[in-house]
């Protein structure tokens, strides 16, 4: 562990209450193929424990979705991954809209610091799939 | 090689016969920019030779595709990456539908074990592109 | 740095003049969360300084875009990442079309050599977003 190979892959636990756009994550071998090796979960949000540059990746699929169902909704459904705390470091890191699709997937390199908590905000009224092969979120430490 | 930096990037060789949804892959410098360094191919399917956590990534583009042509077909086209053998470890790791798009691309971290064979199943009747910059599949060992 | 952990994450600076489909990138902590550690920029294009296998990733979002605005244009908007110089190594590495979507995102493993310059060509007449969480391009050295 001292090598700094911090890594995590999470599966969706649940969405937040009505006014909370955050997705709540869970991880651990007992749950399937998700795991946390270094980072930790704080009330379903991922907290970084080691400074460095990380590869952050995410895939979110909307539940019982067809290409028409996404575009039928007035407010476009958008997924944003960002640092939500500490407040002084709050920033959006990655943002995608679903438009006429049912899945978004992306990845990026970004510097993160010990204590940064990452939030994944899903705006709109569509429920994400909890299937572990359709919705997942992970980080991988890649260098100091 | 003893460092465990197993890595592979494959290009599409061909699709399977009618009742076989699997994509068959090929790799090697003679073919272009694909390669296998550690993992191996078994009848076009990727076999893992070292335990660890891997970053699995894939992009598949449908041949001669327009956004209308995908939705014109009755059965939605879906791509699933999973462990197909040994049977005791069979599981879907990553799944995406094309909906009104012509390309899916995603990636995830997952634990894999020596002997795991990964299959990429394309359901539906649409032929994928064989262009090496449009359709590819790869894995990268990232930590024990 | 001698470990060979070359890495870069870039944000969009500007598009090229009318007949130049290339996107021009910029990077550095003063600009936000972009950085160059090893690779360098040559007139907005990313140049590799160390041989190896790299994970190349990109996300491009079209500006003020809706799912209809992309499909309304006769010429589909396509993003291609490739080696553009030296000419002897020119090749397309990764290609995606927007179709009815507003964002493309993908990644792949590819061998790159010192001196390779990567270009990201956006064909069509649509302007990409310069928001740093919507459009970004990066590479990560992963092994020799």
């Amino acid at each position: 562990e001292s090598l700094g190979w911090d890594i995590a892959e999470l599966q969706l636990n649940h969405t937040g209450p009505q006014q909370d756009p955050r997705l709540y994550w869970q991880g651990g071998p007992a749950l399937g193929r998700s795991f946390l090796r270094g980072p930790e979960l704080d009330k379903g949000q991922l907290r970084i424990r080691r400074d460095g540059i990380y590869m952050v990746h995410i895939q979110v699929t909307l539940a019982i979705c067809s290409s028409t169902s996404t575009s039928r909704h007035h407010h476009p459904t958008t997924l944003a991954v960002g640092i939500c705390s500490p407040a002084s470091r709050s920033i959006s890191l990655l943002r995608l809209s679903f438009h006429q699709g049912c899945t978004i997937a992306s990845q990026r390199l970004t510097p993160l610091a010990r204590g940064d908590t990452l939030c994944t905000n899903l705006t709109g009224t569509l429920l994400p799939s909890r299937n572990t092969d359709e919705t997942f979120f992970g980080v991988q430490w890649v260098r100091p | 090689e003893s460092l465990g930096w197993d890595i592979a990037e494959l290009q599409l060789n061909h699709t399977g016969p009618q009742q076989d949804p699997r994509l068959y892959w090929q790799g090697g410098p003679a073919l272009g920019r694909s390669f296998l360094r550690g993992p191996e191919l078994d009848k076009g399917q990727l076999r893992i030779r070292r335990d660890g956590i891997y970053m699995v990534h894939i992009q598949v583009t449908l041949a001669i595709c327009s956004s209308t042509s995908t939705s014109r077909h009755h059965h939605p086209t879906t791509l699933a990456v999973g462990i197909c053998s040994p049977a005791s470890r069979s599981i879907s790791l990553l799944r995406l539908s094309f909906h009104q798009g012509c390309t899916i691309a995603s990636q995830r971290l997952t634990p894999l074990a020596r002997g795991d064979t990964l299959c990429t199943n394309l359901t539906g009747t649409l032929l994928p592109s064989r262009n090496t910059d449009e359709t590819f599949f790869g894995v990268q060992w990232v930590r024990p | 740095e001698s470990l060979g952990w070359d890495i870069a994450e870039l944000q969009l600076n500007h598009t090229g003049p009318q007949q130049d489909p290339r996107l021009y990138w910029q990077g550095g902590p003063a600009l936000g969360r972009s950085f160059l550690r090893g690779p360098e920029l040559d007139k907005g294009q990313l140049r590799i300084r160390r041989d190896g296998i790299y994970m190349v990733h990109i996300q491009v979002t079209l500006a003020i875009c809706s799912s209809t605005s992309t499909s309304r244009h006769h010429h589909p908007t396509t993003l291609a990442v490739g080696i553009c110089s030296p000419a002897s190594r020119s090749i397309s590495l990764l290609r995606l079309s927007f179709h009815q979507g507003c964002t493309i995102a993908s990644q792949r493993l590819t061998p790159l050599a010192r001196g390779d310059t990567l270009c990201t060509n956006l064909t069509g007449t649509l302007l990409p977003s310069r928001n740093t969480d919507e459009t970004f391009f990066g590479v990560q050295w992963v092994r020799p």
């Epitope: - | 041949a63 939705s71 014109r72 009747t125 032929l127 592109s129 262009n131 449009e134 | -």
Partner: antibody, heavy 120, light 111 residues
């Protein structure tokens, strides 16, 4: 086994319409597309249009104003209708199944053909 | 529309010899790593029969004496060795885009 059986008139009056039914067996219209092609000594083989597995259609632009293709999946029937026929529409009309790959438009099974003469 | 030009219009080949039929497209029919060109055989009084799809793929049940090759705009159908039952008219067809078009045909006679 796969079969496409065509039924329709042999003689059509000028300016009248042509209707042909293609009844299929051995495969499902919810999985395969069906094309219509005609053949005449003067123009050879001409592709007229296609009905996709979901029921949407594409037509040859030269015929789009007077051609209609529809189907009834439950009866395994595809219906072809062409309006305003003239003498140069005299041809053998075929229905044909698209091959398994939905984005490769080649035809692996054909009906026996309906020989149509346009004459008064 | 893509125009397909077949040559020759007719040919006579001795039993057991090779027959070569060409098809030239007015623009490339290549896309996505494939060549969208197909070949049919039609005997008198019968509908066309698919022989080759995607330039070189043999349709199920078609003898290996039939082979196709080519890319871009130039394609060939080869029959070797020719048998008596191969007397027919052969057509190429592209599916690179709509509308689909066919060549005018090449009539093969067995000597």
């Amino acid at each position: 086994q796969v079969q496409l059986q065509q039924s329709g008139p042999g003689l059509v009056q000028p300016s009248q319409s042509l209707s042909i039914t293609c009844t299929v067996s051995g495969f499902s219209l919810t999985t395969y597309a069906v094309h219509w092609v005609r053949q005449s000594p003067g123009k050879g083989l001409e592709w007229l249009g296609v009905i996709w597995s979901v029921g949407s259609t594409d037509y040859n632009a030269a015929f789009i104003s007077r051609l209609s293709i529809s189907k009834d999946n439950s009866k395994s029937q595809v219906f072809f209708k062409m309006n305003s026929l003239q003498a140069d529409d005299t041809a053998i009309y075929y229905c044909a199944r698209n091959i398994y790959y939905g984005n490769v438009y080649a035809m692996d099974y054909w009906g026996q053909g309906t020989s149509v003469t346009v004459s008064s | 529309d893509i125009v397909l030009t077949q040559s020759p219009a007719s040919l006579a080949v001795s039993l057991g010899q090779r027959a070569t039929i060409s098809c030239r497209a007015s623009k490339s029919v290549d896309a996505s790593g494939y060549s969208f060109m197909h070949w049919y055989q039609q005997k008198a009084g019968q509908p066309p029969k698919l022989l080759i799809y995607l330039a070189s793929n043999l349709e199920s049940g078609v003898p290996a004496r039939f082979s196709g090759r080519g890319s871009g705009t130039d394609f060939t159908l080869n029959i070797h060795p020719v048998e008596e039952g191969d007397a027919a008219t052969y057509y190429c067809q592209h599916s690179r885009e709509l509308p689909l078009t066919f060549g005018a045909g090449t009539k093969l006679e067995i000597k």
